[in-house]
């Protein structure tokens, strides 16, 4: 069965700046990365980035850099600053969807103990 | 435009065999998910076979499979589906579908179907 | 597999109405549901995406809703091109699967 890992990481230099990594476990070819923050997209969650293997990537405030790492990897930088800015307790997750199996999710939050830098 | 037009339609004895085809135009071939879908007489919609873009991952249901194989040409923007060991249930019409990442996989463009008849 | 079931299976109603049809998931499917109409001796066509999302043309009078398990097309006004069978369907895991249709009839 495929699997979504998701990490969450706030950095040390901006205490409020987060890297959001996702990776796919599975086969299949991924179609589509979906990133949000606030719960699953399909459930009441924003969307942060789309990243698509070919037709390339699309991003929305407080997104600041989406990429893909690996083929079945990706990161995404959030600005720290502004309203929008996320705090310690923000859930994130991301959807893959992977042809043909279908789409598999997971979401992820910085740990409350956790240091600055430190990975979920 | 975006048009998908199949053939290859007819009718067919029991244990016979046809080769469906579908032309598509108006569109870069090579970057979508496609399928077979088939809607037998009064009845609902069932996916009997897809193929990512790039033909490395295919689908069958259990009731065509070992029967049918889908299979594409990019270069020729042409979707197939060979059916083989035919039987009376598999009388209907058979659509070509696009899938559409960015929609969840929906299936955003289909054909006008061929009709298949296996009947003594 | 994921089992789709639409109610009902027909509703005979008269142009101006309001309708809406429901689609329940046998499991969660996220927000991954469409919609789609058939016309007779026509291809269905796309009209919802991602739950709620009016495909390119679709006019203002479909609507979609839903999350988890539970979705609803509506369409606010019924117009006499809008008598057809309408589908849902999940595109959340393989193989991807239809609703066995609701018929909008006219009274």
């Known amino acids: 069965t495929p699997e979504v890992w998701v990490q969450v990481r706030m950095e040390a230099t901006e205490l409020s700046s987060f890297t959001i990594r996702c990776g796919f476990l599975g086969s299949g070819s991924i179609s589509l990365v979906t990133v949000s923050w606030g719960g699953p997209n399909g459930a009441g969650g924003t969307t942060l980035a789309v990243l698509h293997p070919e037709r390339g990537i699309r991003q929305w405030a407080p997104a600041r850099q989406a990429r893909w790492e690996t083929q079945s990897s990706i990161s995404l930088i959030l600005e720290g600053s502004g309203a929008s800015s996320p705090c310690a307790n923000t859930t994130f997750c991301c959807k893959f969807a992977s042809f043909p199996e279908g789409s598999w999710e997971a979401c992820g939050s910085l740990p409350p103990s956790s240091d600055p830098g430190l990975s979920a | 435009e975006v048009q998908l037009v199949e053939s290859g339609g007819g009718l067919v004895k029991p244990g016979g065999s046809l080769r469906l085809s579908c032309a598509a135009s108006?569109?870069?071939?090579?970057?979508?998910?496609m399928s077979w879908v088939r809607q037998a007489p009064g009845k609902g919609l069932e996916l009997v076979s897809a193929i990512s873009r790039d033909g490395d991952s295919t689908y069958y249901p259990d009731t065509v499979k070992g029967r049918f194989t889908i299979s594409r040409d990019n270069a020729k923007n042409s979707l197939y589906l060979q059916m083989n060991s035919l039987r009376a249930e598999d009388t209907a019409v058979y659509y070509c579908?696009?899938?559409?990442?960015?929609?969840?996989?929906?299936?955003?463009?289909w054909g006008q179907g061929t009709l298949v008849t296996v009947s003594s | 597999e994921i089992v789709m079931t639409q109610s009902p299976p027909t509703l005979s109603l008269s142009p101006g109405e309001r309708v809406t049809l429901s689609c329940k998931a046998s499991?969660?499917?996220?927000?991954?549901v469409a919609w789609y109409q058939q016309k007779p001796g026509q291809a269905p066509r796309l009209l919802i995406y991602?739950?709620?999302n009016r495909f390119t043309g679709i006019p203002a009078r479909f609507s979609g809703s839903g999350s988890g398990t539970d979705f609803t097309l509506t369409i606010s006004s019924l117009q006499p091109e809008d008598f057809a069978v309408y589908f849902c369907q999940q595109a959340y895991r393989s193989p991807w699967t239809f609703g066995q249709g609701t018929k909008l009839e006219i009274k």
């Open positions: 579908s696009r899938h559409e990442d960015y929609f969840g996989f929906a299936m955003d463009s």
């Open positions: 499991q969660s499917v996220s927000n991954d």
């Open positions: 991602y739950v709620s």
């Open positions: 108006g569109f870069t071939f090579s970057s979508y998910h």
